[in-house]
Interface confidence: low
């Protein structure tokens, strides 16, 4: 039988009446155009909706936009366009919402051709009021908030000036010219690249990396011959041109650019790229593109300093620079990542790691699924997940994989079951254990979202025809009920729920089309009456994460510790509630070789946990570049995996001796170091 049609499916009683009483329609008095939606703050219920309509005239485009505000999670909206003086808002800049619960919003307006600068509308009270401010420059990018202080804003101008405001956009000061890329670091530090000669494009590879820690009063050049830079976790990365040729290398700093080390990664040529796939304060996943237009590269995982790298995955699918990769952090379970590889026969296969890139494996075939036509053996195959690449290839995949940190273990994704990703219409699969096992959840492509920390999953069929039905499940996708939310079907455009999966409200967005006009419409459904009572202790059960063999004493040990979670029973129909916090009990494991990565100069042969010397380095002194000096490494080949918390057991010895010799890295020499003040 199809998923969800079993006899024992727990039906929610009287749900139609309960949902009908909690379904709120809002028709926007608008021609269709485009619509964008932003949540303002966390748990505030405030939503801003910007509708934009372009009227193409012979010579120019005339635009009109409207701004709406809801303070009840989208049940009711008020037209507040007059607060922004009926100005046309530039949708390419979106709505710049301030960090945390600052309540700050910046909208960038369209201005007429001859004006001296742009115009913004600013609110610091969750969009109840706006202040119009004329800018002394034309913005090139959306305003960037400092993560530490939402009054500090950063913007690049169309003239490549770097502008800073210290009073939430009231006053602006140009702190540097000829800037290509700028980013906020920690402690209100700004990093940016500048060009000396022609332009950002012409000087690529000859840029300088600068830093200011006092909002532009003084500067320090922290790098030269820069191609690009990036921030990830506590790491600052720069790709730097080599002296002798057109290759470039990654340098890394963990002290805001004061000192740099050369990452033990392959150098790349002009047509290749590096990409930080994921980073936290412990480590980084780095993709290094293969030479030639192969569409793949290698994933490396770093040590705790971002310097020594272990090869994690070969033939990792990542199309040309800025292209598509399926790399996905499964946020519902620690250590889990999913991505795609391009196999020798050019088919695309999905791989999963449960230990932060230590080992990769195929996804287990779902119990209730047959192998498709891509499988050589009809009894042996794997699940393959559709993500960004499939979406970019216009396959019938409306959504990327979904997981939420507070919906422990749940992963939802489109996929196919075979030897590789199939171009046939996919189905939707769910895992409730962080990707170890999978079940077909819904037939055919769907939009889906998680509400109430996993207590409810909502889905809408992906169809070219108008729709009026929503599906929901209160048991992690085992059983589904359908609810007709409107008599008149709408052309569906999106499903919106408050980020963080804490809400019980879902908004269905779409438009109605008649002979004369089309209008935006939203339906917000509150599921609070479906989950009538608050969950109690008896509704939760203990679950050991990463458990694969309960008989094994090491069962659940990942990165040196195991975690037991309290999880909602599938049979419990109750509210986790907005204040729900994941309850977990960690316990430390003893160390084994699995808790160590191979040190510089060592590698792990396949299917072996021991690190052995790289043949080409055998008998050589191990020397590597650290903080601009050459270091001598005495090691028996192991280094603790970043974030690994194991204790006792195996403890390989390693020692680093300073050789007091300078590295050959041309990145920064003392004479290039300079400080400047405005």
């Amino acid at each position: 039988s199809a998923p969800g049609e079993d006899e024992e499916c727990g039906r929610v009683r009287d749900f139609v009446a309960k949902l009908a009483n909690n379904t709120h329609q809002h028709v926007f008095d608008d021609l269709r155009g485009s619509v964008s939606l932003s949540w303002v703050g966390d748990s505030t219920g405030v939503i801003l909706v910007l509708t934009t309509f372009h009227v193409p005239l012979v010579i120019m485009t005339f635009g009109q936009s409207k701004l709406y505000r809801s303070e009840d999670y989208g049940k009711n909206f008020k037209d507040i366009t007059d607060l922004i003086n009926n100005t046309f808002i530039r949708t390419e800049f979106g709505m710049a919402i301030g960090p945390e619960n600052s309540g700050k919003v910046v909208l960038t307006a369209e201005v007429s051709g001859g004006s001296r600068g742009g115009r913004i509308f600013r609110s610091s009270d969750f969009a109840k009021n706006f202040v119009q401010t004329d800018l002394p420059f034309h913005p090139l990018t959306q305003m960037m908030y400092s993560p530490q202080n939402s009054d500090y804003l950063l913007a690049l101008s169309t003239e490549n000036g770097l502008w800073v405001s210290k009073n939430f956009g009231g006053k602006w000061e140009e702190i540097h010219k000829a800037v290509c890329l700028a980013k906020w670091g920690s402690d209100n530090t700004i990093f940016f690249t500048t060009y000396a000669n022609g332009s950002c494009k012409a000087d690529l590879g000859a840029l300088e990396l600068w830093r200011t820690s006092d909002l532009g009063k003084s500067f320090k050049t922290i790098g030269v011959k820069i191609y690009s830079f990036g921030l990830g976790g506590r790491f600052l990365f720069a790709s730097v041109m080599a002296d002798k040729d057109t290759t470039r290398r990654i340098h890394v700093s963990t002290d805001q650019g004061d000192t740099w080390s050369m990452a033990q990664l392959p150098s790349v040529g002009q047509e290749q790229f590096y990409s930080i796939l994921a980073a936290n304060d412990d480590m980084v996943f780095m993709h290094v593109d293969e030479p030639g237009d192969t569409g793949f590269g290698t994933i490396f995982t770093s040590d705790d300093r971002g310097i020594v790298y272990s090869k994690s995955l070969d033939r990792h699918l990542y199309t040309t620079t800025g292209g598509e990769t399926d790399f996905t952090n499964v946020t519902s379970l620690r250590g889990v990542y999913i991505t795609s590889v391009l196999s020798e026969d050019n088919s695309i296969q999905t791989m999963i790691t449960f230990d932060q890139g230590g080992r990769w494996t195929h996804l287990r075939k779902p119990e209730n699924s047959e192998c498709d036509a891509t499988a050589k053996n009809k009894n042996e195959c794997s699940l393959h997940i559709h993500a960004s690449y499939s979406i970019s290839q216009k396959l019938n995949v409306p959504m990327a994989p979904l997981s939420e940190p507070n919906a422990v273990g749940i992963v939802i994704a489109h996929g196919s079951v075979g030897d590789a990703i199939s171009v046939m219409v996919p189905d939707v699969y769910i895992s409730d254990d962080g990707g170890y096992s999978w079940t077909k959840m819904l037939e055919g492509p769907h939009y889906y979202t998680i509400l109430d920390a996993g207590g409810i999953i909502v889905a809408i069929e992906h169809s070219s025809r108008p729709i009026n039905v929503i599906k929901f499940s209160t048991d992690e996708g085992q059983c589904w009920q359908t609810y007709t939310f409107t008599r008149d079907p709408i052309y569906f455009t999106g499903l919106a729920s408050e980020p963080g999966a804490r809400s019980m409200n879902i908004s269905i967005w779409g438009f109605t089309e008649s002979f004369l006009t089309s209008q935006w419409v939203s339906y917000t459904i509150d599921f609070k009456d479906i989950l009538e009572r608050n969950c109690e202790e008896k509704d939760y059960t203990i679950w050991l994460a990463h458990s694969t063999d309960p008989e094994d004493y090491e069962d659940g040990c990942i990165l040196g510790y195991k975690e037991q979670f309290l999880r909602l029973r599938k049979s419990s129909v109750c509210q986790n509630g907005r204040d729900y916090v994941v309850t977990k009990q960690p316990s430390i494991c003893l160390c084994s070789l699995e808790d160590f990565l191979c040190d510089f100069g060592y590698y792990r042969p396949e299917n072996d946990s021991k690190c052995v010397e790289q043949p080409e380095l055998k008998g050589h002194d191990l020397e590597f570049c650290l903080y601009g000096r050459e270091e001598h490494l005495t090691t028996n080949g192991y280094r603790k995996i970043p974030g690994d918390k194991c204790q006792g057991g195996v403890n390989p010895v390693r020692e680093v001796k300073d050789l007091k010799k300078k590295c050959t890295s041309n990145f920064l020499s003392p004479e290039k170091q300079n400080s400047k003040s405005n």
Epitope: S587, I588, C589, C591, N651, V653
Partner: antibody, heavy 129, light 107 residues
């Protein structure tokens, strides 16, 4: 020979802090973890936490979390245990003990416990008003 | 955390006799268990590690056995210097935990 020498006895008032040192000699300091164990008068042994001398990473028993800090100084091969917000029930003998870590990882990926094989002589901490 | 329970709390044995001490874990600790001896006014001393391996310099009359949740320390023929308190300790999962101790006294 391998030995751990701890600092002398301390008398402290409630609410104060105490910092006990443990100097290691006779082996490579960074090759073994160090645990701290305490024993109240007439009571059993109670594990407080562990420190890895290589990176200084620590793990504390939940009971002492927020009150205990373990540090190390590799230049003097010394580990320290500081306990703050002292109460009368913290009156005990505090021991440092060289913790397992096994042999250097040459063997298979075994998870084998070698026991706390070397102990300090103990430091008596008395908390009294 | 894993709770270690030792029995009996006190064991009265005559010199030359056999003493059997028991230690039970609330969940499996595999063979990650150690036994210690402590005499009044002294620091504990490691006797057995890995549940059954004698530490350096420990006489053959001390032996350990067991795996999982049930462990035994046996002293085949008690000598006068063996009268002391004995503790078991697990290192399977942090936090490390000790049993409450068994006091072996002269009968």
């Amino acid at each position: 020979q391998v030995q751990l020498v701890q600092s002398g006895a301390e008398v402290k008032k409630p609410g104060a802090s105490v910092k006990v040192s443990c100097k290691a000699s006779g082996y490579t300091f960074t090759s073994r973890y160090m645990s701290w164990v305490r024993q109240a008068p007439g009571q059993g042994l109670e594990w407080m936490g562990i420190i890895n001398p290589v990176g200084g990473s620590t793990s504390y028993a939940q009971k002492f979390q927020g009150r205990v800090t373990m540090t190390r100084d590799t230049s003097t091969s010394t580990v320290y245990m500081e306990l703050s917000s002292l109460r009368s029930e913290d009156t005990a003998v505090y021991y440092c003990a060289r913790d397992p870590s096994g042999i250097a990882a040459a063997g298979p990926a075994s998870r084998y416990y070698y026991g706390m094989d070397v102990w300090g002589q103990g430091t008596t901490v008395t908390v009294s008003s | 955390e894993i709770v270690m329970t030792q029995s009996p709390a006190t064991l009265s044995v005559s010199p030359g006799e056999r003493a059997t001490l028991s230690c039970r874990a609330s969940q499996s600790v595999s063979s990650n268990l150690a036994w210690y001896q402590q005499k009044p006014g002294q620091a504990p001393r490691l006797l057995i590690y890995g549940a059954s391996t004698r530490a350096t310099g420990i006489p053959a009359r001390f032996s350990g056995s067991g795996s999982g949740t049930e462990f035994t320390l046996t002293i085949s023929s008690l000598q006068s210097e063996d009268f002391a308190v004995y503790y078991c300790q697990q290192a399977r999962l942090g936090p490390w935990t000790f049993g409450g101790g068994t006091k072996v006294e002269i009968k």
